[in-house]
């Protein structure tokens, strides 16, 4: 996790803000969310655990056109150390059931407002 | 623009078989990976099986496993669900989708009735 702040920052983006700033923009979609989010686009779940980061960002990342979780998309790549390109999936990644991107991003935001309230912030 | 035909639905005793078949035109077929997806009456969507561009990869939601069978013909641009053993639970609309790509690409679904 080194500069999460891009060009504009002054200097690297502490862990706890940058987890902080990732829940409130997890927040804003839930709550701003009229129509089916991402026209009711599928995802592969992912297991909440170790490379969380990475595995929401390798399934989240094969949505295109779709402008609500495109700063999602670009936040979660700075948890992540690893370039992450549409289709590609690691090991860890195990596909076993796809549900809405709505229902993704509710349950990777109440594990990560968990992590933050534990103090976990890498 | 993205096009895809749904057919093969219709009433089915419990155990019965039924193969569904998703026509697809406007995009190349045999670089996408494929979704079939079901919702019941009154009920959300729910995903039920994909399958690689290449058709060497299949995946199954837990429901279907076992029963289900997702297949693809590049050549005719066609992907296809064998049912096998059905249950008055698989009743529903079922849809085949370009995967990633939500409903506004979807077609008008097949629906599918399990009853005695």
């Known amino acids: 996790l080194t500069c999460l702040g891009g060009f504009a920052s002054p200097g690297p983006v502490p862990p706890s803000t940058a987890l902080r700033e990732l829940i409130e923009e997890l927040v804003n979609i839930t709550q701003n969310q009229k129509a089916p989010l991402c026209n009711g686009s599928m995802v592969w779940s992912i297991n909440l655990t170790a490379g969380m980061y990475c595995a929401a960002l390798e399934s989240l990342i094969n949505v295109s056109g779709c402008s609500a979780i495109e700063k999602t998309q670009r936040m979660l790549s700075g948890f992540c150390p690893h370039k992450v390109s549409a289709g590609q999936f690691s090991s860890l990644h195990v596909r076993d059931t796809k549900i809405e991107v709505a229902q993704f991003v509710k349950d990777l935001l109440l594990h990560l407002k968990k992590l933050f309230r534990e103090g976990q912030f890498n | 623009e993205v096009q895809l035909l749904e057919s093969g639905g219709g009433l089915v005793q419990p155990g019965g078989s039924l193969r569904l078949s998703c026509a697809a035109s406007?995009?190349?077929?045999?670089?996408?990976?494929m979704d079939w997806v079901r919702q019941a009456p009154g009920k959300g969507r729910e995903w039920v099986s994909t399958i690689s561009p290449s058709g060497r990869k299949t995946w199954y939601a837990d429901s279907v496993k076992g029963r289900f069978t997702i297949s693809r013909d590049n050549s005719k641009n066609t992907l296809y669900l064998q049912m096998n053993g059905l249950r008055a639970e698989d009743t529903a609309v079922y849809y085949c989708?370009?995967?990633?790509?939500?409903?506004?690409?979807w077609g008008q679904g097949t629906l599918v009735t399990v009853s005695s």
């Open positions: 989708a370009k995967a990633y790509t939500g409903f506004r690409y």
């Open positions: 406007g995009f190349t077929f045999d670089r996408e990976e």
